[in-house]
């Protein structure tokens, strides 16, 4: 399992650190979330061949997964802090049903999976203290995701694989763009 | 272990468009971002910009009227294009990846001459 | 954009000696500084990330410190193979922006 924030997981030649700021805590975090990703999308990749399959643009297009697109003010051009943490607190919100479908997909795995959905809210705890503007922040409808979730666990095996694999994709990706907007914060 | 081939022309006439393209070999090209970075002889790095697979783009202000970015993820292919070339931007041109911070892989260099 | 500031612009040093390069943002960065070392007619290498932490693979003789403004990079004992050009870079925020390199030359 990855090293909790707080503790470093990386080789540091300076030990003597100042504390962190709010924004090195959000940063450290993330990390922490992606080092768990990658340890699922490993076990992923070395069950199923979904990582290499060309078959994924198929499968994409049936799980609504957030994305980040221009108009959410998290890239370079058109920047604005305020829209991006809405769009980033929501996307980890939508997120969350997933990670949920997640929890029973892996055996070796399994408190890895756990970490990464807890370490989540977690970091969705940060992040809501950081906003100033909490209305604009929409939460899924439970029961939208509850029967999201029956559809997801009810999909054949192969396309259960697959769903896997696009979630833990799909949130790296998602945590890789709002790291590098959140550092502009 | 991941490798960055690149590739463009060497000679530009003053008013040209510069076109360089980086491979990626051995290594996932959807979980990084692909940068291009120049270096004028004997001066230091400057960044041009950068291009994610779904053809998200950031690049630099002092550039931005003139440089294109563009990817094409089915031959895990990223290209440079900088219109209206003028000796000033005769330089080393390196393509890189960043995941979360540095850059971490860099392709060989292309030496990118303007002169009339 | 955040300017970057290396000092000094050279230095000549010896085998062994305990070289120290700063680098200055304009601005505050928290801990978002790479170092590079770059040899003639190369592309720079990756030393140092996140202020920090040693890239995979470089010796444990580099290391780097700072948080904020003002950037430390320290080899503790210069090898022959450490005569180079080192550049700090930012990555908070966009543009990218580099420092002008320190040239490390045998004394």
């Known amino acids: 399992a990855p090293v909790p924030p707080g503790e470093d997981s990386k080789d540091v030649a300076a030990p003597h650190r100042q504390p962190l700021t709010s924004s090195e805590r959000i940063d450290k975090q993330i990390r922490y979330i992606l080092d768990g990703i990658s340890a699922l999308r490993k076990e992923t990749c070395n069950k199923s061949n979904m990582c290499e399959s060309s078959k994924e643009a198929l499968a994409e297009n049936n799980l609504n997964l957030p994305k980040m697109a221009e108009k959410d003010g998290c890239f370079q051009s058109g920047f604005n802090e305020e829209t991006c943490l809405v769009k980033i607190i929501t996307g980890l919100l939508e997120f969350e049903v997933y990670l949920e479908y997640l929890q029973n997909r892996f055996e070796s795995s399994e408190e890895q999976a756990r970490a990464v959905q807890m370490s989540t809210k977690v970091l969705i705890q940060f992040l809501q203290k950081k906003a100033k503007n909490l209305d604009a922040i929409t939460t899924p409808d439970p029961t939208t995701n509850a029967s999201l979730l029956t559809k997801l666990q009810a999909q054949n095996q192969w396309l259960q694989d697959m769903t896997t694999h696009l979630i833990l994709r799909s949130f790296k990706e998602f945590l890789q763009s709002s790291l590098r907007a959140l550092r502009q914060m | 272990q991941v490798q960055l081939q690149q590739w463009g022309a060497g000679l530009l006439k003053p008013s040209e468009t510069l076109s360089l393209t980086c491979a990626i070999y051995?290594?996932?090209?959807?979980?990084?971002?692909w940068s291009w970075i120049r270096q004028p002889p004997g001066k230091g790095l400057e960044w041009i910009g950068e291009i994610f697979h779904s053809g998200s783009t950031n690049y630099n202000p002092s550039l931005k009227s003139r440089v294109n970015i563009s990817v094409d993820t089915s031959k895990n292919q990223f290209s440079l294009k900088l219109t209206s070339v003028t000796a000033a931007d005769t330089a080393v041109y390196y393509c890189?990846?960043?995941?979360?911070?540095?850059?971490?892989?860099w392709g060989q260099g292309t030496m990118v001459t303007v002169s009339s | 954009d955040i300017q970057m500031t290396q000092s000094p612009s050279s230095l000549s040093a010896s085998v062994g000696d305990r070289v120290t390069i700063t680098c200055r943002a304009s601005q505050g960065i928290s801990s978002w500084l790479a170092w590079y070392q770059q040899k003639p007619e190369k592309a720079p290498k990756s030393l140092i990330y996140a202020a920090s932490s040693l890239q995979s693979g470089v010796p444990s003789r580099f290391s780097g410190s700072g948080s904020g403004t003002d950037f430390t990079l320290t080899i503790s004992s210069l090898q022959p193979e450490d005569f180079a050009t080192y550049y700090c870079q930012q990555y908070k925020s966009y543009p990218r922006t580099f420092g002008q390199g320190t040239k490390v030359e045998i004394k």
């Open positions: 890189a990846r960043e995941e979360l911070d540095d850059f971490d892989i």
């Open positions: 051995g290594g996932s090209f959807r979980e990084y971002y």
